[in-house]
């Protein structure tokens, strides 16, 4: 650690005195302190001399000697008082700038330690300090306002009692800056804008911050716009607003608009897109296939996306048949707005019934006209099967009718014994009918097919089964020839006797 001569913590001299402060260290040493007049520095290897032959009150202060090469950063200090009867204060700063909740040191240094008992801090023109101002005093450093608040940004003076009267220092302006958490908060409205050529438009860019020192501007396609700024202060925040008003928009006004705000903490920006169109538009689309197939009893949501400007004047869902004149219940129709110009309309069809298959149309209207988007809904059914014994052209024939959607495939099985359903062990013969005859195939209805199995003679201890299947499920019908006649066995518990 460097050593200072004279080896006293404080030195009191009179104005005009010669002061010599010598610092000696192991390596080179440096003097530091408040930049002030009349000092001369002389360095000679491991010592440095700070001297003046005409000390003034302005030389009052703490002088520190350091050894730059010392890794421990040791230093020594001496405080010099130049006690001027006419100047009790040496003010080291015209202005002190701190952040809120920091301690603010007002650096009025007492030039005579004897005066310490009679010091006080006041605001300029003798005004008292604001309530709750918590401060302390050090003759070496000055007055410290603890945990300074923004409201304490004032002009202060230090007061000392000299011969029964108060002597004031020059004033010190305290600037307490609000702690800025980050760049200003921004809003740019609207988030998106569409106008028809010739219409009016407004874009508002606003920024706010706890500190007044910030800039905000609006730019169009990277060109800064010259717009007058409105300023305001409310909710303890400074607000700056830029409003772009366009009476009659044209295509050159279209494009990207960015609202940009910056302060010492950085920059924030947000953007929007302005579209200028020739005329009103209305576009309907769906992410779904317009041809829908759903199993009977299940539910379906039909969704339509609408892009429109100007806004919709009307919209509705309509059932176009073919089964009944029922219309979708309004409570099942749902509208959600994604943003100003895009909406989603949903029709919920829970637990679909056979009569609800058909065409559903969404219609929408705006000043640009009306548009419709139609879905075709076909219901899927598992096959229903029935078998009868008949003679065709004199030949005994088993006739199997299967009805379902999609179109069922038909397989005939012959098995031993009398059974409701042939199992693998009993099967004697299997016939696939690749091309059953289609009896009916109307849109939105089941498809009915017919398959014929010509049997020369019915074996009485055997069962003939017609099986039909499609993507939804399968159905079957067992036919049991008996001496009194033929018996047929429908699936499950049903028994049919012709």
């Amino acid at each position: 650690i460097p050593v200072i001569e004279p080896s006293v913590p404080e030195l009191v001299v009179k104005p005009g005195a010669t002061v010599t402060l010598r610092c000696v260290g192991n390596g080179s040493v440096e003097w530091d302190g408040p930049p002030s007049p009349h000092w001369t520095l002389y360095s000679d290897g491991s010592s440095s001399i700070l001297s003046t032959n005409n000390a003034t009150f302005q030389n009052t202060g703490t002088y520190r000697c350091t050894e730059p090469g010392d890794p421990l950063g040791g230093s020594a200090a001496i405080h010099l008082y130049v006690k001027d009867p006419a100047r009790p204060w040496n003010v080291l700063a015209q202005e002190v700038v701190v952040f809120e909740d920091q301690d603010a040191l007002l650096p009025c240094l007492l030039t005579d330690p004897v005066l310490e008992a009679g010091v006080s801090l006041v605001r300029v023109r003798g005004r008292p300090l604001m309530r709750h101002t918590n401060y302390s005093f050090s003759p070496w450093h000055g007055f410290t306002i603890h945990r300074a608040k923004f409201i304490q940004s004032q002009d202060y003076q230090c007061s000392a009692l000299m011969g029964g009267r108060k002597v004031m220092s020059i004033s010190i302006r305290l600037k307490v800056q609000k702690v800025i958490p980050g760049p200003p908060a921004l809003t740019l409205v609207p988030a998106e804008l569409v106008r028809i050529r010739g219409e009016a438009a407004q874009i508002v860019c606003s920024a706010s911050s706890v500190d007044v020192n910030f800039d905000v501007f609006l730019q169009h396609n990277n060109t800064k716009l010259a717009i007058p700024q409105q300023s305001d202060f409310h909710n303890n925040r400074y607000q700056k607003v830029l409003t772009l008003n366009l009476d009659q928009v044209d295509f050159q006004h279209a494009g990207n608009y960015s609202c940009v705000a910056s302060n010492v903490q950085g920059k924030h920006s947000t953007s929007m897109f302005f579209r200028v169109v020739e005329s009103a538009y209305l576009n309907l689309s769906s992410e779904q296939n317009l041809i829908q197939e759903v199993t009977v009893g299940e539910g379906l949501n039909l969704k339509v996306m609408v892009e429109a400007y100007p806004g919709l004047q009307g919209f509705n869902w309509t059932y176009l048949g073919p089964f009944s004149d029922h219309q979708p219940e309004p409570k099942l129709a749902n509208a959600t707005t994604k943003d100003t110009y895009r909406h989603t309309f949903t029709l919920s069809l829970p637990r679909l019934k056979p009569s609800e298959a058909g065409r559903y149309s969404f219609l929408a209207r705006n000043p640009g006209g009306w548009r419709a988007l139609t879905f075709e809904l076909t219901l899927r059914y598992p096959p229903e099967v029935s078998v009868i014994w008949t003679f065709i052209n004199g030949s005994g024939t088993l006739l199997c009718a299967a009805s379902g959607y999609p179109q069922p495939n038909v397989t005939w099985l012959q098995c031993s014994g009398h059974t409701d359903r042939c199992d693998e062990a009993q099967v004697l013969q299997v016939w696939d009918d690749p091309y059953p005859e289609v009896l009916s195939q109307e849109p939105f209805h089941k498809v009915t097919v017919q398959s014929l199995l010509t049997v020369e003679t019915l074996e009485h201890n055997q069962t003939y089964e017609c099986r039909a299947h499609n993507s939804v499920g399968s159905g079957s019908w067992a036919f049991i020839p008996i001496s009194a006649g033929a018996h047929t066995h429908p699936p499950d518990e049903f028994l049919f006797t012709p």
Partner: antibody, heavy 117, light 110 residues
Framework: QVQLQESGPGLVKPSETLSLTCTVS??????YYWSWIRQPAGKGLEWI?????????NYNPSLKSRVTMSVDTSKNLFSLKLSSVTAADTAVYYC???????????WAQGTLVTVSS | QSVLTQPPSASGTPGQRVTISCSGS????????VNWYQQLPGTAPKLLIY???QRPSGVPDRFSGSKSGTSASLAISGLQSEDEADYYC???????????FGGGTKLTVL
């Protein structure tokens, strides 16, 4: 070795505020005085003002009404704001460390600030 | 208009001794110490002399400073081509409560 680096916009519009920041590296900002100096093209140097790490500031009287300096010891940086700028404020701006007798031992490389619309 | 007065230019040939003067008043040079800075083209000023005649480490002893009354001077002996630069004097000014500078002297090595 102490190093100083200025940052801030190189172009400022008339009547707006010039803002510069000086970041100190290779040493602590604490317990030293830090100054701003400027130099118009082809001209001499002009001291703008100084700030101590406690927030004490002294400004050149000719600029005092327009200058604000601040310091952030946690980030080892100090800042200059010069308001209501005109073309006469176009200059290379330097930040530097000021010592006891008013000399500057460390300087930044300087940043040119042009005031123009 | 600078507070301290310097000649705008000076010149010399390699090996020569050149002196640059700086004139002030009682509120600056008369009562305070003088500092000198060298500014090479396109660079920041560099401290050359502080407190009238003190050289920071790394500055050759060819550079020396002196002060008398309200004037100061910088002497460069054994002039070298790399000494071609602008030189500025500076001193604390009591009325400014800060440093003032001279207008600078452009030194040309012929």
């Amino acid at each position: 070795q102490v190093q100083l680096q200025e940052s801030g916009p190189g172009l400022v519009k008339p009547s707006e505020t010039l803002s510069l920041t000086c970041t100190v590296s290779g040493g602590s900002i604490n317990s030293y005085y830090w100054s701003w100096i400027r130099q118009p093209a082809g001209k001499g140097l002009e001291w703008i003002g100084r700030i101590y790490t406690s927030g004490n500031t002294n400004y050149n009287p000719s600029l005092k009404s327009r200058v604000t300096m601040s310091v952030d010891t946690s980030k080892n940086l100090f800042s200059l704001k010069l308001s209501s700028v005109t073309a006469a404020d176009t200059a290379v701006y330097y930040c530097a460390r000021e010592r006891l007798t008013g000399y500057f031992d460390y300087w930044a490389q300087g940043t040119l600030v042009t005031v123009s619309s | 208009q600078s507070v301290l007065t310097q000649p705008p230019s000076a010149s010399g040939t390699p090996g020569q001794r050149v002196t640059i003067s700086c004139s002030g008043s009682s509120s600056n040079i008369g009562s305070n110490t003088v500092n000198w800075y060298q500014q090479l083209p396109g660079t920041a000023p560099k401290l050359l002399i502080y407190s009238n005649n003190q050289r920071p480490s790394g500055v050759p002893d060819r550079f020396s400073g002196s002060k008398s009354g309200t004037s100061a001077s910088l002497a460069i002996s054994g002039l070298q081509s790399e000494d071609e630069a602008d030189y500025y004097c500076a001193a604390w000014d009591d009325s400014l409560n800060g440093p003032v500078f001279g207008g600078g002297t452009k030194l040309t090595v012929l």
